[in-house]
């Protein structure tokens, strides 16, 4: 707390300006009025104030607005946002896009603060849902933005967002995050014709099921080594070689580098020997011929 | 009176890891933002990453992104820099700095970090 | 990024002579400049901050001015313990940025 102390003769401040960065911590307590710094907000961020003296402002307009800043105020915060702590934040109702932005835009660069991240939560619930503009704005400032939500938290994107994904924002995404997203994307993308779909739902595929890639594989669409090993295991495993060959088109011959790496290692396994010497890439660890195959799966289905 | 004791810097090999320390006194390092420049032989002063007071707002510059993580003990009035996957452009004086906003207004004495096979 | 670039890179110049080096940023920065002195060997010190705002214990004959895109600092009457090289700092934005510096010699 800043000692309250009388305003020296003189000193009493008529507007913000740059005259306030030569005022000492108790000259700018005593001598800016809290409504006018709340009026002329959208000078702060042009004057070179230390963090010292931003403290001093944030505890004026605390002391002014004890429920939370209106947004007239939020939307000028500039750095002064760096001196927020979540416990402020989340006492603010912040509705437009554009102030969301601006905050945003003080963080860029930045990692992904508490700050911000309550600031995003604030606003996504605030708004119902994740639309596409939030979502757009979002990603555009941390494209990892879409991986750091919970499967439950996505599951309220509507399809209709995930035109507003670019591949890099699925980077970090785990199979339980792809696996709520996939399901959109094919929704979003349905009426795309065969290869403008598969370009589109290249990046969620790590969420699709088996039935899907055997689809895929009837679509001569090439798919390449990199998202073939971001696909689901239990996904793959069900893949012929014949299915694996036309979904791989020419970057079948991959898998031979990829050989003790899931999901291909894995595969392997499940496939027959003479079905993967087809492929004439040298790939070992098939059934031998003659063996019998249970698919214990299916017996537990039916017992 | 403030000051600032860098340590850790040496000698490393290109990929390798190394991590810095700050020690602070003086002055109430809980209060304070703290930031890390460097300066390659010869060169001129380079910005790089600092963290907040309470340690929840980082920034790196786009030529450590990735490779190093500031971070600090307010109990123990430290700041830190881990160097991962160390590059030969990476030699150079690393200080550390207290970050007012506007300036720094105090540095450390800087210590000598060379990678080189 | 924002772009520091000082003028001249260096400069010869005598006791007693007035010093004058120049910062322009690549953008309106407004105010947010500071200027620091670096001996060999040392580490930079603070000199002015705020563009013109003279830091407690520095010698009056550095001063500072400008805002914008343009900056000055000058040394009214050189000291022999001024030769060194001296940097100016944008904080305007993320990162913040350097100039390349000015050496101060002996003429």
């Known amino acids: 707390e800043v000692e309250k102390t009388a305003c020296p003769s003189g000193k009493k401040a008529r507007e913000i300006d740059e005259s306030l960065i030569f005022y000492k911590k108790w000259e700018l307590e005593a001598c800016v009025d809290a409504a006018l710094l709340a009026t002329q907000m959208d000078r702060v961020n042009a004057i070179p104030f230390t963090y010292e003296q931003l403290d001093v402002l944030k505890h004026k307009l605390d002391e002014l607005y004890p429920q939370g800043y209106p947004e007239s105020v939020i939307q000028h915060l500039g750095y002064l946002f760096l001196k927020m702590s979540p416990e402020d934040i989340r006492k603010w109702n912040v509705t437009s896009l554009e102030t969301l932005k601006a905050l945003l835009e003080v963080n860029k660069g930045h990692e992904m603060s508490p700050q911000v991240a309550t600031l995003i939560d604030r606003f996504v619930k605030g708004r119902g849902q994740l639309d596409k503009d939030t979502l757009d704005t979002l990603t555009a400032f941390y494209p990892g933005y879409l991986c750091s939500l919970s499967p439950e938290e996505l599951s309220s994107v509507p399809p209709s967002s995930i035109w507003a994904v670019r591949p890099q924002d699925l980077d970090t995404c785990d199979p339980r995050q792809l696996d709520v997203l996939y399901p959109k994307a094919r929704l979003a993308f349905q009426n795309m014709n065969g290869s403008e779909y598969f370009v589109k739902i290249q990046s969620f595929l790590g969420g699709a099921p088996t039935e899907d890639l055997k689809a895929l594989s009837q679509q001569n669409v090439s798919m390449d080594l990199a998202t073939f090993m971001k696909l689901r295991t239990d996904a793959v495993l069900p893949l012929t070689v014949a299915e694996v060959q036309k979904l791989l088109g020419p970057h079948v011959e991959g898998l031979k580098a990829e050989e003790r790496h899931r999901p291909v290692r894995d595969w392997i396994l499940r496939q027959r020997q003479d079905d993967l010497d087809t492929l004439g890439l040298g790939l070992q660890g098939g059934i031998p011929n003659g063996y019998l195959v249970l698919d214990l799966s299916m017996q537990e289905a039916l017992s | 009176q403030v000051q600032l004791v860098e340590s850790g810097g040496g000698l490393v090999k290109p990929g390798g890891s190394l991590r810095l320390s700050c020690a602070a006194s003086?002055?109430?390092?809980?209060?304070?933002?703290m930031s890390w420049i460097r300066q390659a032989p010869g060169k001129g002063l380079e910005w790089f990453s600092y963290?907040?007071?309470?340690?929840?707002?980082?920034y790196y510059a786009d030529s450590v992104k990735g490779r190093f993580t500031i971070s600090r003990d307010n109990a123990k009035n430290s700041l830190y820099l881990q160097m991962n996957s160390l590059r030969a452009e990476d030699t150079a004086v690393y200080y550390c700095?207290?970050?007012?906003?506007?300036?720094?207004?105090?540095w450390g004495q800087g210590t000598l970090v060379t990678v080189s096979s | 990024d924002i772009q520091m670039t000082q003028s001249p890179s260096s400069v010869s110049a005598s006791v007693g002579d007035r010093v004058t080096i120049t910062c322009r940023a690549s953008?309106?920065?407004?105010?947010?400049l500071a200027w620091y002195q670096q001996k060999p060997g040392k580490a930079p010190k603070l000199l002015i901050s705020?563009?013109?705002r003279l830091q407690s214990g520095v010698p009056s004959r550095f001063s500072g001015s400008g805002s914008g895109t343009d900056f000055t600092l000058t040394i009214s009457s050189l000291q022999p313990e001024d030769f060194a090289i001296y940097y100016c700092?944008?904080?305007?934005?993320?990162?913040?940025?350097f100039g390349q510096g000015t050496k101060v010699e002996i003429k």
């Open positions: 700095a207290r970050d007012v906003g506007s300036h720094f207004d105090y």
């Open positions: 003086g002055f109430t390092f809980s209060d304070h933002y």
């Open positions: 700092q944008q904080a305007k934005s993320f990162p913040r940025t």
């Open positions: 963290i907040s007071s309470s340690g929840g707002i980082i």
């Open positions: 705020a563009a013109s």
């Open positions: 953008q309106d920065i407004s105010r947010w």
